[in-house]
Interface confidence: low
């Protein structure tokens, strides 16, 4: 008794798939595979398959049922911190070649990394036009202020809401100041936080307020303090710069906005007699810490003139270095003072219409605002690589 094996039914490819090899007929032990078009994946029921091959059995049936070629679905896109996502292809469409557009919250954030347009690719990942699978970044817009120009010289003015939204109050031993960078860093003076370098959590950081003693402020805490390696405590103020990393990002708004770092071209806005603005809660002419945030507009002083002013006793020779800049009036009366340390001396970049930090309040004569003496500030532009390296590494 003999029997001939039955040929198997001709395999019909699922939509968006094809059979290989194509044969006139398929008999015992013949096999075929299904391959899906780009953007489609093999599914058996609801389970994805890496590959599919069926073999013709003796009874004329295939050993496996035909799979489906199902369109790749990238799934709902991740939420973007300080941003939002919009479905471009259609409401909730997340399948192959669907397009979504990330955007950042207007006014206070701008998109970094790419243009925010992502496409659902065949690998099942939302992918940017540059090929990135990671989310874009909504970076805070820096240097926005309610003050539109540097203005003329006048001192001891009360700041208004939104004038200095980068201003940070640092408490922890002494009162000092800093300036917000991005949304989780504070730029300050090394001497202001030196004692806390090994105990960062002891720093009480406040922002978004004008009144030093107000209970209404945004609280931030320090995760780490980075003091410039070239700073030597109690041996002058060269390299008087530090960064504080906050343990959480702060929410940016009209009262809390980071200051910009200086561009390469920034020195053209910081020449002798150009006006910078210093702000803080430091000592006023009455000898007390200010209750309200104060600011003063002061001109940059010729570096040689400033060096000469601090060459005579009681100041040691070489007190003013190339890493410093000076600002103030020859006649005195307009200056930063104790308690202002670490705050930013800011300048308006008239090309970008953004404020940037040119100096950090560092040191000066014992008597603030003294005639013939000037406030000395850490020259931030000299430290851009140092700042950028720390921020990128941590």
């Amino acid at each position: 008794y003999t029997s001939t094996a039955q040929p198997c039914p001709y395999p019909m490819a699922p939509p968006n798939g094809h059979v290989s090899p194509v044969q006139a007929k398929y008999i015992l032990k013949d096999s075929f595979s299904i391959f899906c078009e780009t953007g489609y994946e093999l599914l058996q029921g609801h389970l994805p398959l890496k590959s599919f091959t069926a073999v013709c059995q003796k009874d004329g049936s295939w050993d496996r049922p035909m799979p489906a070629c199902s369109i790749v679905d990238c799934g709902p896109p991740d939420d973007l911190p300080s941003g939002r996502v919009e479905y471009i292809t259609g409401p909730g469409v997340t399948t192959y070649k669907a397009v979504i557009q990330y955007s950042c919250e207007e006014t206070f954030y701008t998109m970094k990394v790419n243009d925010g347009k992502y496409v659902c690719e065949a690998d099942g990942f939302w992918t940017s036009s540059k090929g990135e699978k990671s989310l874009p970044v909504c970076e805070p817009v820096c240097g926005l202020s309610a003050r539109t120009t540097g203005g003329r010289i006048y001192g001891g003015q009360k700041a208004k809401p939104g004038d200095f939204p980068w201003q940070v109050l640092i408490l922890g031993g002494t009162t000092a100041a800093g300036a917000l960078l991005y949304d989780n860093w504070v730029l300050t003076a090394a001497h202001a936080v030196y004692e806390q370098k090994h105990d960062a959590s002891a720093l009480d950081i406040r922002m978004g307020t004008l009144k030093r003693l107000s209970p209404h402020y945004t609280q931030a805490w320090s995760e780490a303090v980075f003091i410039h390696e070239g700073y030597t405590h109690d041996a002058g103020f060269d390299n008087d710069i530090a960064l504080i990393k906050l343990n959480n990002k702060v929410v940016i708004n009209s009262n809390i906005t980071p200051i910009c770092l200086p561009r390469k071209e920034a020195e053209s806005f910081m020449r002798t007699d150009d006006i910078g603005t210093a702000s803080g809660w430091g000592l006023t002419q009455r000898g007390f810490l200010a209750r309200n945030l104060m600011y003063v507009d002061i001109p940059i002083v010729d570096h040689q003139k400033c060096t000469a002013a601090y060459e005579k006793p009681p100041y040691p020779r070489g007190s003013v270095t190339a890493n410093m800049l000076c600002a103030g009036l020859e006649s005195g009366g307009k200056d930063s003072c104790r308690g202002d340390s670490g705050g930013a001396l800011v300048f308006l970049d008239s090309e970008t219409e953004r404020w940037f930090v040119g100096g950090i309040v560092s040191w000066g004569s014992m008597n603030c605002g003294e005639a013939g003496q000037y406030g000395v500030y850490t020259k931030v532009i000299n430290y851009i690589p140092w700042i950028e390296n720390i921020i990128s590494d941590f």
């Epitope: 019909m12 490819a13 369109i71 292809t89 399948t95 397009v99």
Partner: antibody
Framework: QVQLQQSGAELMKPGASVKISCKAT????????IEWVKQRPGHGLEWIGE????????NYNEKFKGKATFTADTSSNTAYMQLSSLTSEDSAVYYC?????????????WGQGTLVTVSA | DIVMSQSPSSLAVSVGEKVTMSCKSS????????????LAWYQQKPGQSPKLLIY???TRESGVPDRFTGSGSGTDFTLTISSVRAEDLAVYYC?????????FGGGTNLEIK
């Protein structure tokens, strides 16, 4: 509203190449496949292939591989089809059309057609 | 490739008459997983571009008059015009979109007597 505007008629010599354009307006250009269809008198409609603008994705009907080449410029929202080594067999009206979605390959939107005549 | 065959190639009818035209595919266009037939119908009037009438074999495109009806499943499909009007003078094409390459039928030329 969605519109596909094709370039004008072309009279070409045998052996030459021609490049037809299809400018899309009214929708996100890089999201939808652009199809190309040939129509010769008495021969009905033939699908040449498709391109997904903004990517390298193209699918060609085997019959037209080597004859047609698709490109797209997302800055101008324009798709192009180049036909090479023209013969009289290539004399036809060529349409661009837009697929409905990635999975739905029927064509709701069509260009007005470009007549290509190949004659010595 | 899937071959699409249409019949008749031409027919002439009077206004108000019912018309049916056929489209056959060389393999089934019914996909068992979703029970959908991957077939569309187009109308092409003289000097114009084709216009979509029907997709999924029987779903009318928005704006298409309800006198146009698509039916059929598997390999046999029909387009019916319940009451022909003068403006229906056109060539009607079927197209499958089951797998690459998409192919069209040869067309049915509808003439008005």
């Amino acid at each position: 509203q969605v519109q596909l505007q094709q370039s004008g008629a072309e009279l070409m010599k045998p052996g030459a190449s021609v490049k037809i354009s299809c400018k899309a307006t009214g929708y996100p250009f890089s999201t939808y496949w652009i199809e190309w269809v040939k129509q010769r008198p008495g021969h009905g409609l033939e699908w040449i292939g498709e391109i997904l603008p903004g990517s390298d994705n193209t699918n060609y009907n085997e019959k037209f591989k080597g004859k047609a080449t698709f490109t797209a410029d997302t800055s101008s929202n324009t798709a192009y089809m180049q036909l090479s080594s023209l013969t009289s067999e290539d004399s036809a009206v060529y349409y661009c059309a837009r697929r409905t979605t990635a999975t739905r390959a029927w064509f709701v939107y069509w260009g007005q057609g470009t007549l290509v005549t190949v004659s010595a | 490739d899937i071959v699409m065959s249409q019949s008749p190639s031409s027919l002439a009818v009077s206004v108000g008459e019912k018309v049916t035209m056929s489209c056959k595919s060389s393999q089934s266009l019914l996909y068992s997983s979703n029970q959908k037939n991957y077939l569309a119908w187009y109308q092409q009037k003289p000097g114009q571009s084709p216009k979509l009438l029907i997709y999924w074999a029987s779903t009318r495109e928005s704006g298409v008059p309800d006198r146009f009806t698509g039916s059929g499943s598997g390999t046999d499909f029909t387009l019916t015009i319940s009451s022909v009007r003068a403006e229906d003078l056109a060539v009607y094409y079927c197209q499958h979109y089951y797998t690459y390459p998409w192919t069209f039928g040869g067309g049915t030329n509808l003439e008005i007597k």
